[in-house]
Interface confidence: medium
């Protein structure tokens, strides 16, 4: 079998709400993969475990089951969804985030996902970690690859 | 209905401790933060602080944060606030309310009964 | 922390009539939402207290509409029209706004 290549293209959108009697943010954050099938013979996109982490807290994730079927040689971009909750011991971030003296509220975020693929009974899993940036002030559409976070290191937050 | 039960009248000497527990009925304990309110005689009520039950989050009352520890028992659906080193000002009732709602719209909707702490020697 | 101060504690009334509680705040409770976080509680003798406005204006769960909220971002008002003989107790503003939340030192209603 030839390789079936996973791309973490980027975060495609990210929807923001407050609670702020909890000093809590919400951020649905949705994020675009590209997969491309380099077989002969479709396969099957069985599941997508995603995660977010914040300062390397996990504050979200998600699950995606019986997503598509890819065909032979051929690539399908997948968005998927993942609610996150900013509260409790990083509810200082609430501050920040709602802060109206500054125009971009950037926060650092790591984005984990692991595809699986199924063919012919056989399964494959591949992951990605992505740091991406996230305007937790406001609802933002990004360009596919805009909210990338070049510096490799773990950020200090 | 939704109750807050809490535990009977403590008699205590200063530099003592006492435990207070506060027992929830009637909806998923879980799913609503437990705040705890101090009550002087003859003065205003006090915000001591919260515990996330789902979590075991704490926030508390900077004037508060050394004399009172909250816990949460998730499998008895109980809160509980430990008094330390008590002096004759935490002499009070003290009240357990939940905090309900939704997203945005958060109240004290449910109040324990209270519990009277007499610190005496 | 954010002081609340009740200028009257104490307030006698006449059955049947109206009253008016204040209440101010040492710092604006209007949020960027355009909520303001405010609570009314009321205290009845030898009771737990309990829940009568939310958000400055909004009347909870139960509670008769004789009792209404109203104010601006510092300064709220609690008003009873047709006060009743169950009405006496001793009434707190709350913050909830910021930690640590605080009440107002009280007001209590006493029947003439």
């Known amino acids: 079998p030839r390789s079936i290549d996973v791309k973490y293209i980027g975060v495609k959108s990210a929807y923001v709400s407050y609670d702020v009697q909890k000093r809590t943010i919400y951020l649905n954050i949705t994020n675009t993969l590209n997969i491309t099938n380099n077989n002969y013979y479709s396969v099957e996109v069985e599941n997508i475990t995603a995660q977010v982490q914040f300062s390397k807290t996990v504050i979200g994730k998600a699950r995606l089951n019986n997503i598509t079927i890819i065909g032979p040689l051929d690539m399908k971009q997948i968005d998927y969804t993942v609610p996150t909750v900013i509260a409790e011991e990083m509810s200082y971030m609430y501050d920040f985030c709602t802060l109206i003296s500054i125009k971009v509220h950037n926060i650092v975020l790591m984005m984990q996902v692991t595809v699986t693929t199924t063919y012919f009974g056989h399964s494959e899993q591949i992951s990605q970690e992505r740091y991406q940036y996230v305007d937790c002030g406001r609802n933002t559409t990004y360009q596919l690859g805009q909210s990338e976070y070049l510096n490799v290191l773990q950020p200090q937050q | 209905q939704v109750q807050l039960q809490q535990s009977g009248a403590e008699l205590a000497k200063p530099g003592a401790s006492v435990k207070l527990s506060c027992k929830a009925s009637g909806y998923t304990f879980t799913n609503y933060w437990m705040h705890w309110v101090k009550k002087r005689p003859g003065q205003g009520l006090e915000w001591i602080g919260y515990?996330?039950?789902?979590?075991?989050?704490?926030k508390y009352n900077q004037k508060f944060k050394d004399k009172a520890t909250l816990t949460a028992d998730k499998s008895s659906n109980t809160a509980y606030m430990q008094l330390s080193s008590l002096t004759y000002e935490d002499s009070a009732v003290y009240y357990c309310t939940r905090e309900g709602g939704s997203i945005s719209d958060w109240y004290f909707d449910v109040w324990g009964t209270g519990t009277t702490v007499t610190v005496s020697s | 922390d954010i002081v609340m101060t009740q200028a009257a504690p104490s307030l006698p009334v006449t059955p049947g009539e109206s009253v008016s509680i204040s209440c101010r705040s040492s710092?604006?409770?209007?949020?960027?939402?355009?909520?303001?976080?405010l609570y009314w509680f009321l205290q009845r003798p030898g009771q737990s207290p309990q829940l009568l406005i939310y958000r400055m204006s909004n009347l909870a769960s139960g509670v008769p509409d004789r009792f209404s909220g109203s104010g601006s971002g510092t300064a709220f008002t609690l008003r009873i029209s047709r006060v009743e003989a169950e009405d006496v107790g001793v009434y707190y503003c709350m913050q909830h706004l910021e930690y640590p939340y605080t009440f107002g030192g009280g007001t209590k209603l006493e029947i003439k």
């Open positions: 710092k604006s409770l209007l949020h960027s939402n355009g909520n303001t976080y």
């Open positions: 515990i996330n039950p789902s979590s075991g989050y704490t």
